[in-house]
C-alpha cells in the first residue's frame, strides 16, 4: 500500500509480489519523486484500492500499456 509522506508526495516502500490481471485494474500513476526511496507504479484497482507495483516487471509495463490504450480508445 502506498504511503503519503506529505500532502503532495506519495511513496511506495514495498511492491506487490502477485500479478494482478489487467481486468482488475482501473488506472495507474507513476511515482518518480526524488523524495521517495524507489520509482514505482501505483495501480488503482476496480475496488478503488491502491497497490504499489515494480515498474521493472513486465506485467506492470504490459498493464500500463493496456490502460493507456483503453484511455485512447473512446467507448462508443
Amino acid at each position: 500500500q502506498p504511503d503519503a509522506i506529505n500532502a503532495a508526495v506519495t511513496c511506495c516502500y514495498n511492491f506487490t509480489n502477485r500479478k494482478i490481471s489487467v481486468q482488475r485494474l482501473a488506472s495507474y500513476r507513476r511515482i518518480t519523486s526524488s523524495k521517495c526511496p524507489k520509482e514505482a507504479v501505483i495501480f488503482k484497482t476496480i475496488v478503488a484500492k491502491e497497490i504499489c507495483a515494480d515498474p521493472k516487471q513486465k506485467w506492470v509495463q504490459d498493464s500500463m500499456d493496456h490502460l493507456d490504450k483503453q484511455i485512447q480508445t473512446p467507448k462508443p
Epitope: R18, K19, S21, R24, T45, V47, K49
Partner: antibody
Framework: QVQLVQSGAEVKKPGSSVKVSCKAS????????ISWVRQAPGQGLEWMGG????????NYAQKFQGRVTITADESTSTAYMELSSLRSEDTAVYYC????????????WGQGTLVTVSS | EIVLTQSPATLSLSPGERATLSCRAS???????LAWYQQKPGQAPRLLIY???DRAEGVPARFSGSGSGTDFTLTISSLEPEDFAVYYC??????????FGQGTKVEIK
Amino acid sequence: QVQLVQSGAEVKKPGSSVKVSCKASGGTFSHYGISWVRQAPGQGLEWMGGVIPIFHTANYAQKFQGRVTITADESTSTAYMELSSLRSEDTAVYYCARYDAHYGELDFWGQGTLVTVSS
Amino acid sequence: EIVLTQSPATLSLSPGERATLSCRASQHVSDAYLAWYQQKPGQAPRLLIYDASDRAEGVPARFSGSGSGTDFTLTISSLEPEDFAVYYCHQYIHLHSFTFGQGTKVEIK
C-alpha cells in the same frame, strides 16, 4: 482468522423460495467478494453467482439468471442468496465462499447449508 | 463460459504413490487464474493451489500445481491417507463468470 457462518438447514416446498445468509467475521468486507456455490447430493461444485459488496451489484451464472438474487449488507458483513421457484433438483448443500476481488480464488468457505425441496 | 474438463473421473492409487490430476479448459485461462480445491465427505472444499502453481497457506509441499493456457495439472507427490478425497479445478478469469471442473475422485486402491 476469517470465518463465514451460514444460516441453518431448510426444508421447502416446490415453487417456494429460500434465503440463505452468510456472515463474515475476522476480516474486512471492503475489497472482497462472496460467491455462492452449490452441490447436489453426490454431484460436483456449481458456481451460482457472486457479489462484491462495494459494487452493490451481483453476477449470476446463466443457469440461475432470473431465479437467484445475491445481495450483501456491508454494515453487518452479511451476504444473502435467495433462490425462487424451487424444484426438487434444487435440493443441495449451498456454500458461500470469499474471494479477493483483485484475484478470485475462494480462500475461505462457509460450513454449507442444506436446502431440501420436497412436497 | 469457460468449460473445465477434469480427468480422470476416478483415480485408484495406494498410499505413497504419485497422483497426477488433469484440468483442461475450453479457452485460454489468462494470467493462470486457476485454482485447485480438495473436498472430503461432509466438509466444505479447501483451497490448495491458486494462480495455477502457488500453494495456499498451510498446504503441504507434496501438493503442487503446474500448467498454463488450457492445460493444468495438480500433482500429489506421495499420497498420504488423508489425501483421498475429491479434487476440483476452478477458473476465475472473469469475476462475473467463475466455473468449476466436474471433479476427480482419488480413492484407495
